[in-house]
């Protein structure tokens, strides 16, 4: 998927439905690709991405990828089709309404990824499943 400023014409008359027969229409996701981040050692972070995009295809979900290596921390926000791997990993949690980060094995870095299926759900990335989104101590992530 590509963000709106380079989005190409799409005209697919197929109606996409989920497993329960509910119609799936393109959802809204944060879409800033890769940005430097200061989100570290927190239960939850906000993406601080100002771009909300309409995903190109109805089956796409919101994805966030948090990576830390010796040099920096980055946060990636995109739309992606859960039928296709992303960064070589399957999006196992694509039906979740919340973006709950799961660690993945990647050599040379700490790598967390989450996916979710409610509008703009990759704006709030959760590293602790016990974390309650109404927690007033929510810390904002600041991009460089």
């Amino acid at each position: 998927t590509i963000p709106p400023h380079v989005q190409k014409s799409v005209n697919n008359d197929m109606i996409v439905t989920d497993n329960n027969g509910a119609v799936k229409f393109p959802q809204l996701c944060k879409f800033c690709d890769v940005r430097f981040s200061t989100c570290d050692n927190q239960k939850s972070c906000m993406s601080n991405c100002s771009i909300t995009s309409i995903c190109e295809k109805p089956q796409e979900v919101c994805v966030a990828v948090w990576r830390k290596n010796d040099e920096n921390i980055t946060l990636e926000t995109v739309c992606h089709d859960p039928k296709l791997p992303y960064h070589d990993f399957i999006l196992e949690d694509a039906a979740s309404p919340k973006c709950i980060m799961k660690e993945k094995k990647k050599p040379g870095e700490t790598f967390f990824m989450c996916s979710c299926s409610s509008d703009e759900c990759n704006d709030n990335i959760i590293f602790s499943e016990e974390y309650n989104t109404s927690n007033p101590d929510l810390l904002l992530v600041i991009f460089q």
């Epitope: 989920d18 119609v23 229409f25 309409i54 309404p97 509008d119 703009e120 704006d123």
Partner: antibody
């Protein structure tokens, strides 16, 4: 099939209150941002406000013309969107549409007439 | 708020004509621009989103272009069912404002 059905439109006096409802079906209501858009007779479209998903806090945004008078809420257990309108003015007379925010799904609209 | 200005406010055209409607934003909105069609007594229908992406089910005679502040909706060959009012809407910032509309009438 996605369906949005508004109800609650009526004739009301200036200063009065009214609550509109929008019953949603055919999609996962709890996952979607929802909006109200209105259209005064013979005029253009005007965005009224939106409510975001409950999991992201159910945050609301409003147009300046209705802020402080109108309240948008949602009940995900009933798949229903609401618009509580207080301190109504004659210029609030319009057809009110319920929509899935920024996507092409609209209700048929419900007419609100504010007149003495 | 971002102001959206459409021109012309109305136009008369014949079946088969090429029709162009323009929309100007009071500040840059990147490509966060949608076009709607509305017929009397009906809810609006989304034609184009993200300035140039054709909504599912919309005929290919409709196209959109532009970015920044200036945008265009083009109907390559006007059909009888295209006589309606067209609105642009920016979704770059809240509130997502509409243009005042362009009524396309039969000449």
């Amino acid at each position: 099939e996605v369906q949005l059905v508004e109800s609650g439109g009526d004739l009301v006096k200036p200063g009065g209150s009214l609550r509109l409802s929008c019953a949603a079906s055919g999609f996962t209501f709890s996952n979607a941002w929802m909006s109200w858009v209105r259209q005064a007779p013979g005029k253009g479209l005007e965005w009224v406000g939106r409510v975001k998903t409950t999991v992201s806090g159910g945050t609301t945004d409003y147009a300046a013309a209705v802020k402080g008078r109108f309240t948008i809420s949602r009940d995900d257990s009933k798949n229903t969107l609401y618009l509580q309108m207080n301190s109504l003015k004659t210029e609030d007379t319009a057809i009110y549409y319920c929509t899935i925010d920024l996507r092409d799904y609209w209700g048929q609209g419900t007419l609100v007439t504010v007149s003495s | 708020d971002i102001q959206m200005t459409q021109s012309p406010s109305s136009l008369s055209a014949s079946v088969g004509d090429r029709v162009t409607i323009t929309c100007r934003a009071s500040q840059s909105i990147s490509s966060y621009l949608n076009w709607y069609q509305q017929k009397p007594g009906k809810a609006p229908k989304l034609l184009i989103y993200a300035a140039s992406s054709l909504q599912s089910g919309v005929p290919s005679r409709f196209s959109g272009s532009g970015s920044g502040t200036d945008f265009t909706l083009t109907i390559s060959s006007l059909q009888p069912e295209d006589f309606a009012t067209y609105y642009c809407q920016q979704s770059y910032s809240t509130p997502p404002t509409f243009g005042q509309g362009t009524k396309v009438e039969i000449k």
